[in-house]
Amino acid sequence: CKAMHVAQPAVVLASSRGIASFVCEYASPGKATEVRVTVLRQADSQVTEVCAATYMMGNELTFLDDSICTGTSSGNQVNLTIQGLRAMDTGLYICKVELMYPPPYYLGIGNGTQIYVIDPEPCPDSDF
């Protein structure tokens, strides 16, 4: 297993609709054809997997149908979007990139993106 540098923004504010997008960029040492991207969430020293996708270079990322993540790739960059976020989901989201094929296997873990999520103010009742 060889180490690889992964860069991501330090802090991002999700939209009022609970959507956060950020770029995860990795310094690929070779010409990988198969890449796996995993988003991990760290909160109170507990790490959980948010979503993961394996893709072939030049193809779209395919997450599971019920995943809260979507993404696109361009060269050594992955544009990740996480949706359905609530204030309680505020935390550190870490991008993990694995170059699966061809060998050698490379692993890179970013420093994490702090995603802040603000629940929208409830609309005041209105009379019609």
């Epitope: 923004p9 330090a10 802090v11 991002v12 504010l13 999700a14 939209s15 997008s21 950020f22 760290q42 909160a43 109170d44 204030a87 505020t90 935390g91 550190l92 420093n111 994490g112 702090q114 802040y116 603000i118």
Partner: antibody
Framework: QVQLVQSGAEVKKPGASVKVSCKAS????????INWVRQAPGQGLEWMGW????????NYAQKLQGRVTMTTDTSTSTAYMELRSLRSDDTAVYYC??????????????WGQGTLVTVSS | EIVLTQSPGTLSLSPGERATLSCRAS???????LAWYQQKPGQAPRLLIY???SRATGIPDRFSGSGSGTDFTLTISRLEPEDFAVYYC?????????FGPGTKVDIK
């Protein structure tokens, strides 16, 4: 080295608007956020809101909602805070501060020098 | 919104004495998101402590922070003349990123 340099003092009449700038240097501007904080004469610090320089999304203090707008110009690494419909109790020193996050910890590590805004008829 | 209460409002001490400042939150705050600032007249605030207990770059080791949940403490082990100032806590756990009202440390 990281620096935040703010625009100069302003004197405004009640009902007018003011726009304070905060030019950042020494770091990757879009990686972090910018907090705006104000301090009325002899009073404590009041958080006004923040902007994510990465995507331009904003979060404002409820009491200022509708009167304040925070923006960034990533081409010049500058953040702006505009406050409208000024009142005498908006007289304060306005600070910008970098919102830094690392390893799950967030705080304002670098501050601008402050901009005095005086609202007087 | 999380309300931060600081006590005492004013602390009158002599150089060389120990200062203990309290910051209490109305609801639990992760220690990762609690910071302390020092402010002197006519100056911008200066970061002292982040993550409840980590000293910022260049801050002398006489300053220390502790606490978790709703109770946090800033301790100055031996007051130096330059330490007489106002101290604020701030939380970044949830918006709004509220400040405490401050504790003024002045010379007795």
């Amino acid at each position: 080295q990281v620096q935040l340099v703010q625009s100069g003092a302003e004197v405004k009449k009640p009902g007018a608007s003011v726009k304070v700038s905060c030019k950042a240097s020494g770091y990757t501007f879009t990686s972090y956020g910018i907090n705006w904080v104000r301090q009325a004469p002899g009073q404590g610090l009041e958080w006004m809101g923040w902007i994510s320089a990465y995507n331009g999304n904003t979060n404002y203090a409820q009491k200022l909602q509708g009167r304040v707008t925070m923006t960034t110009d990533t081409s010049t690494s500058t953040a702006y805070m505009e406050l409208r419909s000024l009142r005498s109790d908006d007289t304060a020193v306005y600070y910008c501060a970098r919102l830094y996050c690392s390893g799950g910890s967030c705080y304002s590590d670098y501050w601008g020098q402050g901009t005095l805004v005086t609202v007087s008829s | 919104e999380i309300v931060l209460t600081q006590s005492p409002g004013t602390l009158s001490l002599s150089p060389g004495e120990r200062a203990t400042l309290s910051c209490r939150a109305s609801q639990s705050v992760s220690s990762s998101y609690l910071a302390w600032y020092q402010q002197k007249p006519g100056q911008a605030p200066r970061l002292l402590i982040y993550g409840a207990s980590s000293r910022a770059t260049g801050i002398p080791d006489r300053f220390s922070g502790s606490g978790s949940g709703t109770d946090f403490t800033l301790t100055i082990s031996r007051l130096e003349p330059e330490d007489f100032a106002v101290y604020y806590c701030q939380q970044y756990g949830s918006s709004p990123f509220t400040f405490g009202p401050g504790t003024k440390v002045d010379i007795k």
